[in-house]
């Protein structure tokens, strides 16, 4: 049997204590030896039965006295075997041994759980010499015990290269339950079961767990720690905690919020960062994610022109970085833009729609039906064309750019003319006779210069030749028309 000192006899119906029938004391236990103050010791039980051999190590000295009487075997006296006390209380325990005076330099060391206790511990050794023996009492005190002081303490003494070891003194520090695992906040799918775990330890054991959901007890009877609660599903946010009970009282875990995953809120603050003729860069502020990470977003683009067919273009993109460049748009057009994002539950509603416009672009096509002919009487080249389709002008025409290249006997020079937007004809002076003139025309908007038309060539003869037929933009397939007159 283990010797025990307990704080108080406190039976608790149907909660069996760890050491049934034993006493416990919160006062400093008085062990083996009378205390100077005359304070009465707590109830102690001898750890050995009559006639039972001592459990500690015993040294049998070889030295004999003058009368040649063998010395009795050396051993620590029996002491209290188990001390149970509450956290933050003080405790003092000791080892005692009587050593024949023939032995010098005897020291006692304290060990806890197999490791020597060195340094700043309150260990005091007192010597009480007598005629033949010296009583040595080693005391160990802890002023405010903590759970870490739990353990098995022993005394050791070295004599004649022999080690004498005391019986262990078990210190058990009891307190309120201490959580080793508490429920964690989670985001869960609506109406889907999930588990929460709660674990707490003593001493004293057992530790019993109650679960609390939104301030209502889930289990009306306690469950032994550790406890796993299977929550059968939630339809709305709930707060869970667990209560851990032991004979010392109860400890309540932190309350954790369990959120229900939902579709996200729509993005807000959709704004235009940059516009070009054919693209718009937008950004947005994501809405609340519905307790589930965003997966991707969808940008919806509608032509704002009331005459358009109302079709919606959809562009999918990743949820980050809340930025998207919408491409393949028409120039100088108005668009309505909305953004929606999704998580594992589904798509958000669309953000408030915003209006955005593309800028003017350079025309996307060249003027059509370019014709060139020589007006010899005025020594000019007349050029005519048709303006490009309005849809493909990509802006408001501000004019045309005419490139005319003159090539003769190994020399070549290019000249550029700007023409106002009103007409669809131009006249340029002949620069060189007996030369080929190559004409190309591009439409111009504020957005820039469009592509040039295919080249049209006309031969300008020397002075004195007669009538000239016009040259014109070739039919498809004629790569490089030359009109020789």
């Amino acid at each position: 049997a283990i010797t025990e000192a307990r704080e108080e006899a406190k039976p608790y119906p149907l909660f069996p204590g760890p050491f049934p029938g034993s006493l416990q004391t919160d006062h400093t236990p008085l062990l083996s030896l009378p205390h100077a103050s005359g304070y009465q010791p707590a109830l102690m039980f001898s750890p050995t039965q009559p006639g039972r051999p001592h459990t500690g190590n015993v040294a049998i000295p070889q030295v004999t006295s003058v009368e040649s009487k063998p010395l009795p075997p050396l051993a620590f006296k029996h002491t209290v075997g188990h001390i149970i006390l509450s956290e933050h209380k003080g405790v003092k325990f000791n080892c005692s041994i009587s050593v024949p005076n023939i032995y010098q330099d005897t020291t006692i060391s304290w060990w806890k759980d197999g490791k020597e206790l060195l340094g700043a511990h309150h260990a005091i050794t007192q010597f009480y010499p007598d005629d033949e023996v010296t009583a040595i009492i080693a005391s160990f005190s802890i002023t405010s015990v903590q759970r870490s002081d739990n353990g098995s303490y022993i005394c050791k003494m070295k004599i004649n290269n022999e080690e004498i070891v005391s019986d262990p003194i078990y210190i058990e520090v009891q307190g309120l339950p201490h959580f080793t695992k508490q429920p964690e906040s989670m985001n869960v799918t609506r109406n889907t079961a999930f588990n929460l775990t709660c674990q707490a330890v003593g001493p004293p054991e057992p530790v019993n767990i109650f679960w609390v959901q939104n301030s209502s007890r889930v289990n009306e009877q306690p469950e032994k720690s550790p406890s796993v609660l299977t929550v059968p599903g939630l339809t709305e946010m709930a707060v869970f905690s667990c209560e851990a009970h032991n004979d010392k009282g109860l400890t309540v875990s932190k309350g954790v919020q369990i959120n229900i995953k939902a579709i996200p809120s729509p993005p807000t603050e959709v704004s235009i960062r940059n516009s070009t003729a054919h693209s718009i860069l937008i950004s947005w502020v994501p809405g609340f994610d519905g307790y589930s990470p965003f997966r991707n977003c969808s940008i919806q683009v509608k032509e704002a022109d009331p005459l358009s067919n109302g079709s919606v273009m959809i562009f999918n993109t990743s949820a980050l970085p809340h930025l998207y460049q919408i491409k393949q748009l028409q120039a100088l057009a108005n668009y309505s833009i909305g953004v929606s994002c999704m998580n594992e539950i589904g798509w958000s509603a669309v953000s408030p729609w915003i209006l955005a416009s593309t800028t003017e672009g350079a025309p996307s096509v060249a003027p059509l039906n370019v014709t060139v002919f020589l007006n010899e009487s005025s020594d000019n080249v007349d050029i005519r064309w048709m303006k490009p389709p309005t849809k493909q002008q990509d802006g408001e025409l501000v004019g045309y750019r005419i490139s005319h290249v003159w090539q003769s006997a190994g020399i070549s020079k290019e000249l550029l003319e700007e023409v106002g937007q009103n007409g669809s004809r131009a006249r340029i002076s002949v620069q060189v006779h007996n030369a080929t003139c190559t004409v190309r025309i591009a439409a111009v908007t504020r957005g820039g210069v469009g592509p040039f038309s295919d080249p049209v060539k006309i031969f300008i003869p020397a002075h004195g030749w007669v009538d000239y037929a016009p040259s014109s933009t070739p039919a498809p397939g004629n790569a490089d028309p030359v009109l020789i007159i």
């Epitope: 119906p13 149907l14 109406n191 939104n214 209502s216 889930v218 009306e220 009877q221 469950e223 059968p232």
Partner: antibody, heavy 118, light 106 residues
Framework: QIQLVQSGSELKKPGASVKVSCKAS????????MNWVRQAPGQGLKWMGW????????TYADDFKGRFVFSLDTSVSTAYLQISSLKAEDTAVYFC???????????WGQGTLVTVSS | EIVLTQSPDFQSVTPKEKVTITCRAS?????MHWYQQKPDQSPKPWIY???NLASGVPSRFSGSGSGTDFTLTINSLEAEDAATYFC?????????FGQGTKLEIK
Amino acid sequence: QIQLVQSGSELKKPGASVKVSCKASGYTFTNYGMNWVRQAPGQGLKWMGWINTYTGEPTYADDFKGRFVFSLDTSVSTAYLQISSLKAEDTAVYFCATYGHYAWFAYWGQGTLVTVSS
Amino acid sequence: EIVLTQSPDFQSVTPKEKVTITCRASSSVSYMHWYQQKPDQSPKPWIYATSNLASGVPSRFSGSGSGTDFTLTINSLEAEDAATYFCQQWGTKPLTFGQGTKLEIK
């Protein structure tokens, strides 16, 4: 398997007492509380309260405070319902039922009919 | 205490018909349980915590709801479903039951 077996029907005179038993088997008796539920003839179910089989502490619904006593004998895994000063309106079937998480009555006794008549 | 009101009190239904029983609480509750009771028998656990079928309950049964409004649905009624169904709330003491809905087969 888990079973709750209740004592047989009782015919009592007004003013008398009756003790209904509910013997549990197939599980650890002290792990789950025991509820008592009353069903008057042709009526619905009414929760009377429960007893903590771990501590022995009873809890009574407001309408069942006074003449109703829940008790236990854990050595035989049995819960008891005692009604004193019986009245005609106590005529009903009394059920015991285990108390699970979220007050789920997963297992029920077969019911005991108590008839109070002069 | 929370009062649970079931509707209808009584319903006569033909087999294969869809049946819906509602249970309305006088204030919000966390979960609703449902029990089935046949004449001269004890109630049987039927639907746990609003939507979880008890062991052995046919899949034609389902439960739903939250807050104050809860529903037990039978997708395609069968003859063996003739019984009285009771709802019971968890969340506020005392525990209370609905008055019951009796289903009869036409």
